[in-house]
């Protein structure tokens, strides 16, 4: 809110723009017939600092020189970078209600003179494109500093473009807005950065570069791929270049991979073959172009090119196996179960599954195709039966995989021995086991199954198995293992036409079960007496129960219970106990035992033997 | 526990047919694979047909393409319908369901339903 100096002027010494740490001196001067009306011995002139519009210091005690009532000159000192503002106003002291009134205002830049330019770099976007050079401005200057770029070149070739920096633009990179064609390639052009403001000036070392050092090619287009014969592993990149490119690299990668497949190609004139490619797969394909073999930079990578290679025919053997239930006098259930193919096995969307059932020796054969990865058929108890599965997609089959259908815990002999089960953490289990001791024929391999001690389904709830090499000893299973459930788990030991199998029972993580057993009834047969229960239901088992536990005391008796412990056997739901009084009343509960402890007591109920003492 | 109950059966004609129904209760969430058995006179209980719960079903040789296992999950019950039918179909027919804990299988049965096919 100045009045355009209409009552004075301010001067600065040695000038409005300073170098940090300098001292300026600064003078407001009354114009004639200007001041406080009939007293002039009383105008008071006073300065006043702003900094980004806010006052921050009355200049009053900073006053060198005092022509009363005409003019006084400031020295300031300790500026900082940047503009400051300083106002001179007049203050009529007769006249206390009056504020001061502005006279004339100034402002002082203080900054640094620019550093020479360094780093400078300049490029040309492809063949048509214009050379624009960048450099680093180093320290800040605080000032408007101006910026020349100047090329010059063979035949008298010059060229020249400015830019300025200040506190609202900084300039570090200038568009020359020439083309250096390719029939330069030889030819040396130099460039140098001029900076210049209020404090000094100063250049840049002088960059000298060729074409081929600075043109970047732009990166290729239209990228396409052709698949020879709808090969899925073989393929020719297609691509558009600039005229000049010699060299190009390639990268291509499957979509969920971490590392590129890289390639170079001489001359290769916007076509390439591939002849590593993975089927039925994802890829992303880019392409780099440069303008000559030793020198010169890479162009930027294409955009991606996403593709999915095309299926072939499933390779791998798929992995079987099954379980045999003897459903009526002379038929048995064989239900088939195999784990899907891996992707670079399947090479292509499955779309079927082709089983075969097959009696050796009579050569009755059962066919069928499923979408599933089950399949289930009742056939004869008699004879000897094989089973094979192969994979399709719509390229053809993989090769099926035999299995011979034996009884797999019928040989005692080929029954593996001290079968053991450890939980390693919260979500797998080790097994370890010996081979059968007097096994009449060689081990072909083991497998080992398991299956959630819970009710479920045959078809809905397939086995887990895993198969281990005949010189290996245990296993480490996760697959569906969860903590808290306990599992059954066989490990079978096969020979080419029996199999024998040992069981045994494994959590990977246990607390105490919710509950006991509820006991459901108590009688009394010859002297002793059967307590029956209903198991825990599955999810308050949590985990593999060790043994039940069956306590007893007399009704009303603050002695210890006494207590009967047994094996836990689902199968078993009853349990005889001998050694209470005829005619006393006794109180009666049960307890379940996991490996983490024992389970709060189930129902109690009262019982009063009427046989005679043991 | 599971309970299952037959019904359908009944007196019929050679060449007849008749529609047996299996209702599930109790603890069916993971009974899935439902089977019928059929007992004649002086014979062993044998193996009629089953469906599983992917709905794939599988019959004895002397009833195939005469004889079709369905099943309507939302009613819990499974149906046998039987046509052509001859005198050595006649047994009680028993609705049978299985599933596994580990590796034993519990089976649960019906009372059974008489079908009495004349010649």
């Known amino acids: 809110n100045i009045d355009v100096c209409k009552l004075g002027t301010v001067t600065v010494q040695p000038a409005p723009v300073i170098p940090l740490g300098s001292a300026a001196n600064i003078s407001c001067s009354l114009n004639p017939k200007q001041g406080c009306s009939h007293y002039p011995s009383s105008n008071e002139l006073i300065l006043l600092k702003f900094v980004n519009d806010v006052l921050v210091e009355n200049l009053h005690g900073k006053k060198v020189h005092d022509h009363t009532g005409h003019s006084s000159t400031f020295q300031v000192t300790n500026l900082s970078l940047g503009m400051t503002l300083f106002v001179c106003k007049l203050n009529c002291s007769n006249s206390q209600k009056k504020p001061p009134v502005p006279v004339c205002g100034v402002e002082i830049s203080v900054g640094v003179a620019p550093e020479p330019p360094q780093n400078i770099s300049c490029v040309q976007e492809g063949e048509n494109g214009t050379v624009a050079c960048s450099w680093n401005s180093g320290k800040v200057t605080y000032l408007k500093t101006n910026y020349t770029l100047q090329l010059s070149g063979p035949n008298n070739l010059t060229c020249q473009k400015q830019c300025f920096s200040d506190n609202r633009q900084n300039c570090n990179r200038l568009d020359l807005g020439i083309n250096l064609s390719p029939d330069l390639a030889e030819s040396r052009f130099i460039v140098r950065v001029t900076a210049i403001n209020d404090l000094g000036n100063s250049s840049s070392l002088p960059h000298t570069f060729t074409f081929l050092d600075i043109v970047i090619p732009l990166p290729p287009w239209d990228i396409r791929i052709n698949f020879l014969n709808a090969s899925g592993s073989r393929g020719t990149l297609q691509w558009e270049d600039e005229g000049q490119v010699v060299l190009n690299q390639l990268r291509y990668q499957p979509l969920n991979s971490t590392s590129w497949n890289m390639v170079n190609a001489t001359n290769a004139k916007g076509k390439y073959d591939l002849r590593d490619l993975r089927p039925f797969t994802e890829y992303e394909f880019q392409i780099s172009s440069k303008l000559h073999l030793s020198g010169g930079s890479w162009s930027n990578w294409s955009e991606s090119l996403r593709t999915r290679t095309p299926e072939e025919e499933p390779v791998g053997i798929l992995d079987i196996w099954y379980m045999k239930q003897d459903i009526d006098y002379d038929r048995q259930q064989i239900s088939l179960f195999w784990k899907s193919l891996n992707p670079s096995e399947a090479r292509g969307k499955i779309l079927h599954y082709q089983v075969t059932l097959q009696e050796v020796t009579k050569k009755t054969t059962l066919q069928n195709t499923t979408r599933h990865t089950s399949w289930t058929r009742v056939i004869p108890r008699t004879g000897a039966w094989t089973a094979s599965v192969s994979a399709a997609n719509s390229k053809g089959a993989s090769a099926p995989t035999h299995i011979n259908i034996v009884d797999l815990c019928g040989t005692g002999l080929l029954a593996p021995h001290q079968v053991s089960a450890k939980s390693e953490n919260m979500d797998n289990i080790l097994v370890t086991w010996q081979p059968p001791k007097k096994a009449d024929s060689a081990v072909r391999e083991y497998i080992v199954e398991w299956r959630a001690l819970q009710p479920g389904s045959i078809t809905k709830f397939p086995p887990h198995w895993l198969r281990i090499p005949p010189d290996n000893m245990s296993a480490l299973i996760s697959e569906n293992i969860k903590p808290y459930i306990c599992y059954e788990i066989r490990v079978h030991a096969l020979s080419e036409s029996q199999g024998g199998c040992s069981s045994i029972r494994g959590d990977s993580k246990h607390k105490a079960p919710v509950s006991g057993p509820h006991i459901t009834a108590i009688t009394e047969k010859k002297e002793r007496l059967f307590i029956s229960w209903t198991h825990i239901p599955f999810p308050e088992q949590r985990g593999c129960i060790l043994h039940y536990r069956i306590y007893w005391k007399e009704r009303d008796s603050t002695a210890q219970p006494e207590l009967c412990e047994i094996q836990y056997r689902r199968s078993q739901n009853s349990h005889p106990i001998s050694s209470l009084q005829p005619r006393v009343t006794y109180v009666l509960w049960m307890t379940a035992v996991t490996a983490a402890g024992e389970s709060p007591q189930g129902n109690e109920r009262e019982f009063c033997p009427q046989g005679k003492a043991n | 526990q599971v309970q299952l109950q037959e019904s359908g059966g009944g007196l019929v004609q050679a060449g007849g047919s008749l529609r047996l129904s299996c209702t599930a209760s109790?603890?069916?969430?993971?009974?899935?694979?439902m089977y019928w058995y059929r007992q004649a006179p002086g014979k062993q209980r044998e193996f009629v047909a089953y469906i599983t719960a992917t709905n794939s079903a599988n019959y004895l040789d002397p009833v195939n393409g005469r004889f079709t296992i369905s099943r309507d999950n939302a009613k819990n019950s499974v149906y046998l319908q039987m046509n052509s039918l001859k005198p050595e179909d006649t047994a009680v027919y028993y609705c049978?369901?299985?599933?596994?804990?580990?590796?034993?299988?519990?089976?649960?049965w019906g009372q059974g339903t008489q079908v009495t096919v004349s010649s």
């Open positions: 049978n369901a299985k599933q596994i804990v580990g590796f034993q299988i519990d089976e649960y």
């Open positions: 109790g603890s069916i969430f993971a009974i899935d694979d």
